[in-house]
């Protein structure tokens, strides 16, 4: 066979679908790899060919499009399963070709089983809702293209195992689920099941997502440095270990990059010669507010080190702040014998 541009196995597109449900899978060539769409390719006389490799096999084989009730079919650049079976799991390849041109890409498809409460190995998308922020909605995802607009599906929403009904602040509204006032108690997995008829058969689409209630932008503040502060003085003798924690609280902000860093005499620790290490730990509140702690450590501090300026800096989308640590050299206590002698008026 002549040369074919092989884009390999596109593991970025790890497609997971539920067993016994319809699935429509677009050939990734037109979405990620080629600069033209299927219509252009088709008009130019290119043919789209599908084949697959079963799970735990090496042999590529053509897809059987002659199954009863057209269980697997192709429509333009979409491979359809109506519905999927567990043993459809494997690597699927779509190849676009004519006598002079060839391009192909493979992608993994995993058919997943769910339990009676919709739990499964499926990787769930996370939808963040702001706490006590007014009405917010989530929409049943990835159901476009399964049925024409003339078909009116029924949609049932579940939280975990239970149909959503008579919830105080959560209201199913067709494809949308409305949260009147999102609270921490609304955290969890939400499932919509879309039921629609097609050619005398009933199909179901199950979609689960995780709702995480996070801090509201109404309550967001610039970073707050809890430590260092004016109440704590780091008093050390030369040779001792100097440990200064920088503890910063960040309000949750969607897509904000939270940063904490130290400067020593106005320079980043990496840019100076002293032997300094910095360890960072991060913790989150229930609403994903973040507390970052960076501990600056100098194992054997020198007199020179104790004269330097140690400043903790923090930045988020809400602003930038800085706070200097109070560092000083401990004055040695007078020696006991000298002190006594002075006390008795000895010269």
């Amino acid at each position: 066979s002549e040369r074919c541009d092989d884009w390999g196995l596109d593991t970025m597109r790890q497609i997971q679908v539920f067993e016994d449900e319809p699935a429509r899978i677009k050939c990734p060539l037109f979405e990620h790899f080629l600069k033209f769409n299927y219509s252009t390719a088709h008009s130019a006389g290119l043919t789209l060919i599908w084949y697959w490799t079963r799970q735990d096999r090496d042999l590529e084989e053509p897809i059987n499009f002659r199954l009863p009730e057209n269980r697997i079919s192709k429509e333009k650049d979409v491979l359809w399963f109506r519905p999927t079976l567990l043993n459809d799991t494997g690597n699927y390849t779509c190849m676009l070709r004519n006598t002079t041109y060839c391009s192909k890409v493979a992608f993994p498809l995993e058919v997943v089983q769910k339990d009676s409460c919709f739990n499964s190995p499926m990787k769930l998308p996370v939808h963040k809702l702001y706490i006590e922020y007014g009405i917010q909605r989530i929409t049943c995802p990835n159901v476009d293209g399964y049925f024409p607009s003339s078909v009116k599906p029924t949609i049932t929403w579940y939280m975990g195992c239970y149909k959503i009904q008579n919830f105080n602040n959560v209201i199913p509204e067709g494809m949308n689920l409305s949260f009147l006032i999102a609270l921490i108690s609304n955290n969890g997995n939400y499932t919509c099941v879309v039921t629609y008829p097609e050619n005398g058969r009933t199909f179901h689409l199950t979609r689960t997502l995780t709702v995480k209630v996070v801090g509201s932008p109404k309550n967001a503040v610039p970073p707050v440095i809890h430590s260092p502060n004016d109440h704590v003085v780091y008093e050390k003798e030369p040779g001792e270990e100097l440990l200064i924690p920088c503890t910063v609280y960040f309000s949750f902000l969607m897509d904000s990059r939270n940063e904490v860093w130290w400067t020593i005499d106005g320079k980043k620790p990496d840019d100076i010669t002293i032997d300094v290490t910095i360890n960072e730990s991060i913790s989150h509140s229930r609403t994903e507010d973040e507390t970052r702690t960076q501990i600056l450590s100098i194992k054997k501090v020198t007199s020179e080190d104790l004269k330097r300026s140690y400043v903790c800096h923090a930045r988020s989308a809400k602003g930038e702040v800085a706070k200097a640590a109070k560092v000083k050299q401990k004055v040695p206590a007078p020696r006991y014998t000298v002190e006594l002698a002075c006390g008795f008026g000895a010269t």
Partner: antibody
Framework: QVQLVQSGAEVKKPGSSVKVSCKAS????????MNWVRQAPGKGLEWMGR????????HYAQKFQGRVTITADKSTSTAYMELSSLRSEDTAVYYC??????????WGQGTLVTVSS | DIQMTQSPSSLSASVGDRVTITCQAS??????LNWYQQKPGKAPKLLIH???GLHAGVPSRFSGSGSGTDFTLTISSLEPEDVATYYC?????????FGGGTKVEIK
């Protein structure tokens, strides 16, 4: 297409047990609920319980709790309903009914169980 | 358990007539209501799910409506093959419960 084929009619003595089977085909047995519903002669429908063969989860109507056991054999795509301590008022047609969610989309042909001394 | 009350218990209508059957739940069931058709000596068949969703393959003369506690099954133009008993069933809260049935006959 979905088919549910139930076992044949049974005549049982009071106090004994009956086990009715329901063999499923045409869909993925482990992905749907299997319900059991009964209908006494000339009467309405009465839901007894259900099983999700995928994980074995069961729910029973309080009325039958302790007397009914619903099981499923994934290897043969067969569901079973066993009713014990039979009495004359258990004489009825017993149906299995499959549903991906809660509605019972497809039903078996029914099994007549007669309880008589 | 939720009680489902159907009315009328039986009715007789002519071919082509519009037929309406009602079902009342003892408490709100949030549209979680199915309608089944059972012909003499046969197993029930699902007609309508979730109050108004027509099951695959069911003729469009059947329709369902309602909300809360009151629901209706309508046959827009009665056909001879519609002779059957019709049952409503709630699936809001376990255990699922059925109405007593409405027997539809042709005059």
């Amino acid at each position: 297409q979905v088919q549910l084929v139930q076992s044949g009619a049974e005549v049982k003595k009071p106090g004994s047990s009956v086990k009715v089977s329901c063999k499923a085909s045409g869909y993925t047995f482990t992905s749907s609920w299997m319900n059991w519903v009964r209908q006494a002669p000339g009467k309405g429908l009465e839901w007894m319980g259900r099983i999700y063969p995928g994980d074995g989860q069961t729910h029973y109507a309080q009325k039958f709790q302790g007397r009914v056991t619903i099981t499923a054999d994934k290897s043969t795509s067969t569901a079973y309903m066993e009713l014990s301590s039979l009495r004359s008022e258990d004489t009825a047609v017993y149906y299995c009914g499959e549903g991906y969610l809660d509605p019972m989309d497809y039903w078996g042909q029914g099994t007549l169980v007669t309880v008589s001394s | 358990d939720i009680q489902m009350t159907q009315s009328p218990s039986s009715l007789s209508a002519s071919v082509g007539d519009r037929v309406t059957i009602t079902c009342q739940a003892s408490q709100g069931i949030n549209n979680y209501l199915n309608w089944y058709q059972q012909k003499p000596g046969k197993a029930p068949k699902l007609l309508i799910h979730y109050t108004s969703g027509l099951h695959a393959g069911v003729p469009s003369r059947f329709s369902g409506s309602g909300s809360g506690t009151d629901f209706t099954l309508t046959i827009s133009s009665l056909e001879p093959e519609d002779v059957a008993t019709y049952y409503c069933q709630q699936y809001s809260i376990l255990p699922w419960t059925f109405g007593g049935g409405t027997k539809v006959e042709i005059k």
